[in-house]
Amino acid sequence: QDPYVKEAENLKKYFNAGHSDVADNGTLFLGILKNWKEESDRKIMQSQIVSFYFKLFKNFKDDQSIQKSVETIKEDMNVKFFNSNKKKRDDFEKLTNYSVTDLNVQRKAIHELIQVMAELSPAAKTGKRKRSQMLFRG
Amino acid sequence: QDPYVKEAENLKKYFNAGHSDVADNGTLFLGILKNWKEESDRKIMQSQIVSFYFKLFKNFKDDQSIQKSVETIKEDMNVKFFNSNKKKRDDFEKLTNYSVTDLNVQRKAIHELIQVMAELSPAAKTGKRKRSQMLFRG
């Protein structure tokens, strides 16, 4: 059994998140993940989900009663989602930490916008992809 | 020429983001995008970058002087990144809007954590992927 399972069960107890009422009003993530089978679509969604959990864990990192559980789960997320690649994890972390209200960051972001946009669609990379996109819109 | 180019140039003027000093201290996004060639890795990073721009645009949506530019760029992002797929865009938006400080959201997130984790690595989906992962770690 992966290390995160026991620690996630601990967090469930901490948050009283095992109660049946928690499932009221649908799911946060699981329903959305069900919608997307294509790996690159899943990564788009999982990227947001993982950053949500990292933010959540950051808010609870000082609570000594669950510190070990939080650390273990974060470590296991690094293994699973970033394939234990520290550079990938660091780049991701950098992106999540940029402040959207900082004028210097805003100026840089706008300065880079055209080039970022040019790279957004897989079509930008190869002609083959462009053709398949036109066949399968959506 | 894509519609976004002219409007991005407008935003550059608005933010004085054409000045040479903007490039000081490296890039926000472009350097990171250069690091990742594999499509699924790029999507992990681009997901964060796109959510950053959407947050930025939200902060400026009431500024009539750049409203049209912002709307045009957002629309073009939808076309490029979400392949004009409204469902994909809506799911993405949902994920970016969850409040990490809301206790009910926290409880739901922890309730779903084990299942989310189980789906994080592509290896979880097929044996073939698992094999290729072991050949190409990183």
Epitope: F15, N16, N59, F60, D62, D63, Q64, S65 | L103, Q106
Partner: nanobody, 120 residues
């Protein structure tokens, strides 16, 4: 500021019971999350149990769940830890702690500790 003073420790045989008390002064603890931690010789401090401000929501370390019970009496400004079926590995200094938030945030206020020794 909150001052915490633990009492009730001592020497007990394996299988026996003890009740630790933690008396708070300086402020009423009714809005605090109250917890117990322990440090065994040569080990890091580990979490044992806490009770949230509502008095009904509790959380225990796996190692003590089912054997230890944490309760609070806000009128007496006191928190208790009932320890049953004690094992030699429960031997440690037990510390009472208080956190200002029910969820997240650190335990910022600590007592001096009370020694519990379980002999086999």
């Amino acid at each position: 500021q909150v001052q915490l003073v633990e009492s009730g420790g001592g020497l007990v045989q394996a299988g026996g019971s003890l009740r630790l008390s933690c008396a708070a002064s300086g402020r009423t603890i009714s809005s605090f999350r109250m917890g117990w931690f322990r440090r065994a010789p040569g080990e890091e401090r580990e979490f044992v149990a806490f009770v949230r401000s509502n008095g009904t929501s509790t959380y225990y370390a796996d190692s003590v769940e089912g054997r230890f019970t944490i309760t609070r009496d806000n009128a007496k400004n006191t928190v208790y830890l009932r320890m049953d079926s004690l094992k030699p590995e429960d031997t440690a200094v037990y510390y009472c702690a208080a956190a200002t938030r029910d969820y997240g945030g650190s335990f910022d206020y600590w007592g001096q500790g009370t020694q519990v020794t379980v002999s086999s």
